[in-house]
């Protein structure tokens, strides 16, 4: 089941999924003054069985002023900008994503791609949420949204990642301090305390980290 | 179960200090930003400070900016206010709140008064 | 003066329902942020009653509910219950700011 909406829009923040659930399209869409082939296909799925999966299907571009087919290679690094999904200002990797079966890894890119990426996604879907470059968060840990099926319908659940700007501290914003606890949750500490996913850090990609202030009910 | 338990409120003459705690239990204090809220009496609400889950950046409303300092001790799961130059009209029952804030203590009043 | 603007009373009998709206601005509710609201019932300590727009934490009766739309926010509650008496406040984090805003609290009396 495809999700009805876009993951939600968070001020001064990105969001990337890790892994793509089986079902999920990706457009095949070029940059400007390129266009998907001809007979070429219209989006990459990602489908797979019990052990593995992949993308099906490949986009490929060629150039808007010629008739002929470009051949196909994986552009340099540098010559991706800005996809949608690769936002993230430093890296954020709460798994490997290969570990996680049912689902594909983020698609090499190909020759003459668009600079943003359109994800279909599907139910069940995670999304990780990171404040962009300038901004830190009020408060540690991934927040994540999930799309789930409620009363028929497809919601993303909201994070509520708080990105604040300038400092008003004498520290300087790229120090950090250190943690006065470890990560690890204590034993002795059964509830959560918040909310959404903004503050619910234990999840099913990420099972070490810690929990949510409320409880997981609040999904 | 969450607790949030606020200590150091009481009577101070104008000009002075106070200094509040606000001890944390029931989930993992050093994970979360922390505010401080005030309501003075028969009012609304109003917030005060904020400080990030490591203590590295904090923001004040304009009202305590210069004369109210918060700060957290992750090892000891305790937040703080540092109240000077304390003037009438901080008079009011402070609240430590956690997270949105979505969980608060029960607050401890201050009164300012000469 | 409170950032959020809230009615300053509200009225209803059992069994109606009554709607609380929350307006605000570019810099917090318009901004994109979420809207919360607490209820706060005589001498005690506000408590969460909807987070994120039109979330609920277990707990809390599907009485009550939340919506949100531009620079405003509105709190519904159906079936009015005597214990719904309260003072409400709305909330949203406010990126001039970079704190939470309050609204100045409704005062929800049931008839």
């Known amino acids: 089941e495809l999700c009805d909406d876009d993951p939600p829009e968070i001020p001064h923040a990105t969001f990337k999924a890790m892994a793509y659930k089986e079902g999920t399209m990706l457009n095949c869409e070029c940059k400007r003054g390129f266009r998907r082939i001809k007979s070429g296909s219209l989006y990459m799925l990602c489908t797979g069985n019990s052990s593995h999966s992949s993308w099906d299907n490949q986009c490929q571009c060629t150039s808007s002023a010629t008739r002929n087919t470009t051949k196909q290679v994986t552009p340099q690094p540098e010559e991706q900008k800005e996809r949608k999904t690769t936002e993230m200002q430093s890296p954020m990797q709460p798994v490997d994503q290969a570990s996680l079966p049912g689902h594909c890894r983020e698609p090499p890119p190909w020759e003459n791609e668009a600079t943003e990426r359109i994800y279909h996604f599907v139910v069940g879907q995670m999304v990780y949420y990171q404040c962009v470059q300038g901004y830190r968060a009020l408060h540690r840990g991934p927040a994540e949204s999930v799309c789930k099926m409620t009363h028929g319908k497809t919601r993303w659940t909201q994070p509520q990642l708080i990105c604040t700007g300038e400092m008003e501290t004498s520290q300087f914003p790229g120090e950090e301090k250190p943690q006065a606890s470890p990560e690890g949750r204590p034993e002795s500490e059964t509830s959560c305390l918040v909310t959404t996913t903004d503050f619910q850090i234990q999840t099913e990609m990420a099972a070490t980290m810690e929990t949510s202030i409320f409880t997981t009910e609040y999904q | 179960e969450v607790q949030l338990l606020e200590s150091g409120g009481g009577l101070v003459q104008p000009g002075g200090s106070l200094r509040l705690s606000c001890a944390a239990s029931g989930f993992t204090f050093s994970s979360y930003g922390m505010h401080w809220v005030r309501q003075a009496p028969g009012k609304g609400l109003e917030w005060v400070s904020v400080i990030s889950y490591d203590g590295s950046y904090k923001y004040y409303a304009d009202s305590v900016k210069g004369r109210f300092t918060i700060s957290r001790d992750n090892s000891k799961n305790t937040l703080y206010l540092q109240m000077n130059s304390l003037r009438a009209e901080d008079t009011a029952v402070y609240y430590c709140?956690?997270?949105?804030?979505?969980?608060w203590g029960q607050g401890t009043l201050v009164t300012v008064s000469s | 003066q409170s950032v959020l603007t809230q009615p300053p009373s509200a009225s209803g009998t059992p069994g109606q329902r009554v709607t609380i709206s929350c307006t605000g601005s570019s810099s917090n509710i318009g901004a994109g942020y979420d809207v919360h609201w607490y209820q706060q019932l005589p001498g005690t300590a506000p408590k969460l009653l909807i987070y994120s727009n039109n979330e609920r934490p277990s707990g809390v009766p599907d009485r009550f509910s939340g919506s949100k739309s531009g620079t405003s926010a509105s709190l519904a509650i159906s079936g009015l219950r005597s214990e719904d008496e309260a003072d409400y406040y709305c909330?949203?984090?406010?990126?001039?700011?970079?704190?939470?805003?309050f609204g100045g609290g409704t005062k929800l009396t049931v008839l």
């Open positions: 909330a949203a984090w406010d990126s001039s700011l970079n704190g939470p805003v």
């Open positions: 709140a956690a997270g949105v804030p979505d969980y």
